[in-house]
Interface confidence: low
């Protein structure tokens, strides 16, 4: 399965939206930080078989476009950006799900890492608990936001190993 | 072949405890985690928790933090579930049930403990 | 949580008759981890259907599963006897999981 350049440039359109969606200075919300414990050792790569490490990636594009399709987050940025945003995850799910049959054939349903998925779901519920805790606040939303960016740098840098496996 | 084992019933009286086990056998288990669910008589099932056998993590339902404890023995590959202070309303069917992706989730069940609560 | 309502809670069938079980969720769920399980009475439920439309090992081809975001089905084209049980639908789309109430599906 080849990630493509196509898919390269996906990832970093993906964060650029990221990036242009910040509304306030991260500075104004310090007090607001919180350790989400993102799951780092899921992404370090090495221990995965191929089709686990796209499984992974996959959950973590689903779980962040389930997280900003929410009414909460349509409130709280701006539309046209959404809109993108939606539409470069969804093209990158997309080409997650043609590699993972393209690598285990789609009849089988590769040993994917449980663990490694159910630790991603619950990065994410924790990021959903601290938003109700915070009542949606803009500060709230801005801590989420560069978390789900440092989250996406993660899986992009995986993806670049994928590719280099190629 | 996958088997997960569990004693047929257990009477216990209102306000003790009881431990229910599940032996696994036919696959490698600390490389899956391993479910609990209940089912009361004639009506749905409740998910209760879940703990890898790995490393001992669990993870629970909000509404059994404070009436079910998960643990697994890793030298007797057999997970166990504790359940206190008992009431009527905890009489059921407990069962186990192996995780895993894809159609490998919940492919896998005991065939259930009667659990009943009576004086 | 997701609340997953299913209906009907009963129904009967006639040997050859089309029947439609559904699933409701409270929020929409990710349809890869919508699941459906059969059970018979004294017994463990047996997985059915995964990831909303995929048949698991075993299970006749006259049955099948769709739908998408909060609304999923099970649909057996030609009811036979030994369909009769209850079904239950399943989401491990986000925590805590959870099963619907159940369906029990009789032969007239």
């Known amino acids: 399965c080849n990630l493509s350049q196509t898919h390269s440039l996906n990832n970093r359109r993906t964060l650029m939206l990221m990036a242009q969606m910040r509304r306030i200075s991260p500075f104004s919300c310090l007090k607001d930080r919180h350790d989400f414990e993102f799951p780092q050792e899921e992404f370090d790569g090495n221990q995965f078989q191929k089709a686990q490490a796209i499984s992974v990636l996959h959950e973590m594009m689903q779980q962040t476009f389930n997280l900003f399709s929410t009414k909460n987050s349509s409130a709280a940025w701006d539309e046209t950006l959404l809109e993108k945003f939606y539409i470069e995850l969804f093209q990158q799910m997309n080409d997650l799900e043609a590699c993972v049959i393209q690598e285990v054939g789609v009849e089988e349903t590769p040993l994917m890492n449980e663990d490694s998925i159910l630790a991603v779901k619950k990065y994410f519920q924790r990021i959903t608990l601290y938003l109700m805790e915070k009542k949606y606040s803009p500060c709230a939303w801005e801590v989420v936001r560069a978390e789900i960016m440092r989250s996406l740098s993660f899986s992009t840098n995986l993806q670049k190993r994928l590719r280099r496996k190629d | 072949q996958v088997q997960l084992q569990q004693p047929g019933a257990e009477l216990v009286k209102p306000g003790a405890s009881v431990k229910l086990s599940c032996k696994a056998s036919?696959?490698?288990?600390?490389?899956?985690?391993m479910h609990w669910v209940k089912q009361r008589p004639g009506q749905g099932l409740e998910w209760i928790g879940e703990?890898?056998?790995?490393?001992?993590?669990?993870i629970y339902n909000e509404n059994f933090k404070s009436k079910a404890t998960l643990t697994v023995d890793k030298s007797s590959i057999t997970a166990f579930m504790q359940l206190s202070s008992l009431t009527s309303e905890d009489s059921a069917v407990y069962f186990c049930?192996?995780?895993?992706?894809?159609?490998?989730?919940?492919?896998?069940w005991g065939q259930g403990t009667l659990v009943t609560v009576s004086a | 949580q997701i609340v997953l309502t299913q209906s009907p809670a009963i129904m009967s069938a006639s040997p050859g008759e089309k029947v439609t079980l559904t699933c409701s969720a409270g929020?929409?769920?990710?349809?890869?981890?919508l699941y459906w399980y059969q059970q018979k009475p004294g017994s463990s439920p047996k997985l059915w259907i995964y990831?909303?439309?995929n048949l698991a090992s075993g299970v006749p081809a006259r049955f099948s599963g769709s739908g998408s975001g909060t609304s999923y089905s099970l649909t057996i084209s030609s009811m036979e006897a030994e369909d009769a049980a209850s079904y239950f639908c399943?989401?491990?789309?986000?925590?805590?999981?959870?099963f619907g109430s159940g369906t029990k599906l009789e032969i007239k």
């Open positions: 049930a192996r995780g895993g992706l894809g159609p490998a989730w919940f492919a896998y």
């Open positions: 036919g696959y490698t288990f600390t490389n899956y985690w």
């Open positions: 703990i890898n056998p790995s490393h001992g993590r669990t």
């Open positions: 929020s929409s769920v990710d349809s890869s981890y």
């Open positions: 990831s909303t439309s």
């Open positions: 399943h989401q491990w789309s986000s925590y805590p999981f959870t």
